[in-house]
C-alpha cells in the first residue's frame, strides 16, 4: 500500500509569493511559492495519486503583515481552503498567547490540530479541551493512517504560551500515545512535529511504532540529487535513521516559507512496516502556475493590509537617528530603539531565579536602512519601519559562549571608518573600543547585563560562560562576516519578524524618545 | 533516453472499437502523467484525457465520456487508449505524450510518434 | 471548456526577422500555457512551458510571455527551420485545449 505525504513547515506568514530568498517578491517573473501556486501542485498530485496527506509540522504563524493584521485567521482561512490534512503546533503559535491560537486557528481549523506533549491545566484544560488533540487518525483511501504531534518542549523560552501549558518531554509524551493507537490497531504512524532535526532524528530511534517523521522548527532543507535552488541540503531526502528496534524510518522536512512542498512517498506491507520511502522537496518557482480563484482571495484579503500599512502605531519626540553616518560608526538611537525592542520582545519570566532569561541584543548597523523623522507630527507606521528594516528577517535567540562574542566584538571595528556594516548595535551590553589598537585586540572592555539577579547590573563577559542573545538571523547565519557566529553557536531558535517586533514595542510604548546613552564608548 | 513507443496503424470500420498502445521507456513509468491527443488530418490538436499509471487515475475529456477508455500495464510499462463506437470523424492519428506533474513543466514533454486511425467503411 | 483563440492563422516572415504568435485565453489561466511546434509528418514538440520557460534544448531565439488571458510566442531571429505550425495550449483546466494553430512561413 502507498502512501504520498506532502509536507510544509515554518511557513511564516509567506501567503504571498516571495522572492527565492523568501522575501517580499519584487519581480514576479522569478518569485515562489505562496499559496495559491502551492494549491496547484498539491491539487495536481492529489490528482495523480491514490492516498495522498497533506501535512503541515507547524510554525505558519509568525512572519509577515499577513500575521500582523490578521493573526491568525489568514491561516485557518487559506489552510481550509487547500485542504490540509493535519497540522502540528509549533511554538510561534503561541505568539498571541493561547487566546490568539484558539480564537483565530483552533476554533476555525477543519482539519485537526496536534501535539501530544503538551498538556492545559487549571481553567485553560477544560476551554481548550479538544481543540487541540494528541493525536488523529485519518481514514486514507482503504486504510488509516495514525498522526501523533509534537511541539518544542523550550515553547515557553521562544513565545508566549502562558502558565497553564505544560510542555512535556517529547519523547516521554509521545511514546504512550503511539501505543494507543498500536491498541487501536492503527499500524502506520507518522510523527508529525515542531522540535527541530535533531529532535526529530531521536524520534525516529526511540520512538517505538513511528513509521515516519515529519518535522519543522529547525528550517531544515534535505534533497536527493542536485539541488534546484540555493538552499544546501543538511542530508539526503529523505533522511534515514535506524531505531533502536532495528527499523529504516525516513525523517523529512521541507526548509521554510512556503518555498518548497515536501513529496515523500510511502510504501507499506500489510502489516503496517515501511518496505520503501522515495521522493524529494518539490520547488514551487514561477514555472508552477498561481492558482487564479486562490490568488483572487489573496488579492481580496489583501486590501486590509495595504490600510494597516499607513496606520499610525506610536509616536516618537525624537529623531530616530538610522543613518549610515551614525548607525555604522556609532552608537545610534535607532540601534538602540530596535535593541530594547527585542529585548522586550524576549521577556519570558519562566525562573525565580533569573528577572528574565535573555538579557542582550547584537544588531548589525548595516542592517538599519533608514531613520525616522519626528517632525512628521511624530507619527510611526508600518511602512515607516519597512523602511527602516526592509530585509524581512527575524529576530532569532542564539546560545553563544562569551569568547564567541568576544570575536563578534572585535569583528564589529576590524576595518572601522569605512561605514561597512558589521558594526553592531546592542542592547543589555556596555563595549568600549580603543581604535589604536591592531584589529583583533580593540575591545578593551565588555560588560553584560545579568540575567541571574533581581537588580540587573552590568559585569565584565566570562569567556567560558554560555550567554543568550537576541540578534538578527541575518548575524546568526554569518551575515556581514560573523561567521564566528555561525560556526561557534551552540543553539539558535527562529524569533518573530524583524518590523513586528519593534511596531509592537512601539504600539505597547505608545511615545518613545530613545536615547544615545553610552553603550558604545571608544577610549 | 525517454521514448514513447505506439502501435502501428489500424483500419477499422464504423461502430468498432480500436485499441491504441503506448510503450514507455528511459524514466519510472508510475511518475509521469500520460495524456492523448488526437489530430484530423489538416486539423489542430485535441485532448482527450489523461491516465495517471502510479494510481491508475484516468480523466477523460468530456467529448469522449462513455466511448474512451484509458489503462495501463505497469509490469510493461504500457498505457492504452481505447475508442468504441468509431464514427468516420473520428479518423485521425493519435499520440500519447508525457507529463511531469511532479516537476514544474507545465506542457507534455515527450511525444509518440502516432498511430494512425482510419474508420471507413 | 476554456478556448485558446490563436493568432494569426497564418505568417510570412523573412528569415533574420521577428515572428510573433498570439495566443488569448477565454478565461484565466494563470501562467499555465505550453507552445509547441510541429512540422509535417511529426508528433509536436515542446518549445515553452508554463507561459515563458524555455524547454531544454530549444534555441534562445525562442521566446514566450504572458500570463491570465493574453500570451505571445516570439522567433526574435526566423531561420529556415522555424518553419512549421506553432500551437499554444493550456494546462490550467480539463479539458486541456490547444489553440487552432498558426502556420509560419518564410516571406
Known amino acids: 500500500w502507498e502512501l504520498t505525504i506532502l509536507h510544509t513547515n515554518d511557513v511564516h506568514s509567506r501567503l504571498e509569493q516571495t522572492s527565492e530568498d523568501s522575501s517580499k517578491c519584487v519581480n514576479a517573473s522569478r518569485c515562489m511559492g505562496g499559496v495559491a501556486r502551492l494549491f496547484t501542485k498539491v491539487q495536481q498530485i492529489r490528482r495523480a495519486e491514490p492516498n495522498v496527506l497533506l501535512l503541515d509540522a507547524g510554525d505558519q504563524y509568525q512572519g509577515t503583515i499577513w500575521f500582523t493584521v490578521y493573526k491568525g485567521a489568514e491561516v485557518a482561512h487559506f489552510m481550509n481552503a487547500l485542504r490540509y490534512d493535519a497540522m502540528a503546533l509549533g511554538n510561534h503559535e503561541f505568539d498571541n498567547g493561547v487566546e490568539g491560537l484558539i480564537e483565530p486557528l483552533l476554533k476555525e481549523a477543519k482539519f485537526p490540530i496536534l501535539s501530544a506533549n503538551i498538556k492545559a491545566k487549571g481553567p485553560l484544560a477544560s476551554q481548550i479541551s479538544g481543540l487541540y488533540l494528541p493525536y488523529k487518525v485519518l481514514p486514507v483511501g482503504d486504510e488509516v493512517v495514525g498522526i501523533v504531534g509534537y511541539t518544542s518542549k523550550e515553547t515557553p523560552f521562544l513565545s508566549n504560551p502562558g502558565t497553564n501549558l505544560v510542555f512535556e518531554d517529547e519523547i516521554t509524551a509521545l511514546q504512550p500515545e503511539v501505543d494507543k493507537l498500536k491498541t487501536l490497531n492503527v499500524n502506520k504512524i507518522i510523527a508529525l512535529g515542531h522540535s527541530g532535526f535533531e529532535m526529530d532524528k531521536l524520534i525516529a530511534q526511540k520512538v517505538r511504532g513511528v513509521d515516519v517523521v515529519v518535522g519543522g522548527h529547525s528550517n531544515t532543507f534535505l534533497y536527493t540529487g542536485n539541488p534546484p535552488s540555493k538552499e544546501v541540503p543538511a542530508g539526503k531526502y529523505p533522511f534515514i535513521v535506524t531505531s533502536d528496534d532495528g527499523r529504516k524510518v525516513p525523517v523529512v522536512q521541507a526548509y521554510a516559507f512556503g518555498k518548497y512542498l515536501g513529496y515523500l512517498k510511502i510504501e507499506f506491507d500489510e502489516r503496517g512496516n515501511v518496505i520503501s520511502s522515495h521522493g524529494n522537496p518539490i520547488l514551487l518557482n514561477s514555472s508552477i502556475p498561481e492558482d487564479p480563484s486562490i490568488k483572487a482571495d489573496i488579492n481580496k484579503w489583501r486590501i486590509k493590509l495595504d490600510n494597516y500599512s499607513t496606520q499610525e502605531l506610536g509616536k516618537t519626540i525624537v529623531y530616530l537617528d538610522g543613518s549610515s553616518q551614525s548607525c555604522r560608526f556609532r552608537e545610534c538611537n535607532m540601534g538602540n530603539l530596535i535593541c530594547d525592542a527585542m529585548i522586550n520582545n524576549n521577556l519570558r519570566h519562566t525562573d525565580e531565579m533569573f528577572w528574565n532569561h535573555v538579557s542582550m541584543c547584537i544588531l548589525n548597523g548595516g542592517g538599519i536602512r533608514s531613520p525616522i523623522d519626528e517632525r512628521n507630527n511624530g507619527t510611526i507606521t508600518w511602512e515607516n519601519l519597512a523602511a527602516v528594516l526592509p530585509f524581512g528577517g527575524t529576530f532569532d535567540l542564539v546560545q553563544l559562549k562569551g569568547s564567541t562574542l568576544k570575536k563578534a566584538f572585535e569583528h564589529s571595528v576590524h576595518r572601522y571608518g569605512q561605514s561597512t556594516g558589521e558594526f553592531l548595535q546592542v542592547g543589555g551590553i556596555h563595549v568600549v573600543y580603543d581604535l589604536s589598537r591592531k584589529p583583533g585586540d580593540r575591545v578593551v572592555k565588555l560588560d553584560v547585563l545579568c540575567t541571574k539577579c533581581r537588580v540587573p547590573s552590568y559585569d565584565p563577559l566570562k569567556m567560558d560562560e554560555v550567554y543568550k542573545v537576541i540578534l538578527p538571523n541575518f548575524l546568526a547565519n554569518g551575515g556581514d562576516g560573523f561567521q564566528m557566529i555561525k560556526d561557534e553557536l551552540l543553539r539558535h531558535d527562529s524569533g518573530d519578524q524583524d518590523i513586528n517586533v519593534v511596531s509592537t514595542y512601539i504600539s505597547k510604548m505608545k511615545v518613545i524618545y530613545p536615547a544615545v546613552e553610552g553603550r558604545i564608548k571608544f577610549s | 533516453q525517454v521514448q514513447l513507443v505506439q502501435s502501428g496503424a489500424e483500419v477499422k470500420k464504423p461502430g468498432a472499437s480500436v485499441k491504441v498502445s503506448c510503450k514507455a521507456s528511459?524514466?519510472?513509468?508510475?511518475?509521469?502523467?500520460l495524456s492523448w491527443v488526437r489530430q484530423a488530418t489538416g486539423q489542430g490538436l485535441e485532448w482527450m484525457g489523461e491516465?495517471?499509471?502510479?494510481?491508475?487515475?484516468?480523466y477523460y475529456n468530456e467529448k469522449f465520456k462513455g466511448r474512451v477508455t484509458m489503462t495501463r500495464n505497469t509490469s510493461i510499462s504500457t498505457a492504452y487508449m481505447e475508442l468504441s463506437s468509431l464514427r468516420s470523424e473520428d479518423t485521425a492519428v493519435y499520440y500519447c505524450?508525457?507529463?511531469?506533474?511532479?516537476?514544474?513543466?507545465?506542457?507534455?514533454?515527450?511525444w509518440g510518434a502516432g498511430t494512425t486511425v482510419t474508420v471507413s467503411s | 471548456d476554456i478556448v485558446m483563440t490563436q493568432s494569426p492563422d497564418s505568417l510570412a516572415v523573412s528569415l533574420g526577422e521577428r515572428a510573433t504568435i498570439n495566443c488569448k485565453a477565454s478565461?484565466?489561466?494563470?501562467?499555465?500555457v505550453a507552445w509547441y511546434q510541429q512540422k509535417p509528418g511529426q508528433p509536436p514538440k515542446l518549445l515553452i512551458y508554463?507561459?515563458?520557460y524555455r524547454y531544454s534544448g530549444v534555441p534562445d531565439r525562442f521566446s514566450g510571455s504572458g500570463s491570465g488571458t493574453d500570451f505571445t510566442l516570439t522567433i526574435s531571429s526566423l531561420q529556415a527551420e522555424d518553419v512549421a505550425v506553432y500551437y499554444c495550449?493550456?494546462?490550467?483546466?480539463?479539458?486541456?485545449?490547444f489553440g487552432g494553430g498558426t502556420k509560419l512561413e518564410i516571406k
Open positions: 491516465i495517471y499509471p502510479g494510481s491508475g487515475n484516468t
Open positions: 508554463s507561459a515563458s
Open positions: 528511459g524514466y519510472t513509468f508510475t511518475s509521469y502523467g
Open positions: 505524450a508525457r507529463y511531469d506533474y511532479l516537476g514544474s513543466s507545465y506542457g507534455f514533454d515527450y
Open positions: 495550449q493550456q494546462h490550467y483546466n480539463t479539458p486541456y485545449t
Open positions: 478565461q484565466d489561466v494563470s501562467t499555465a
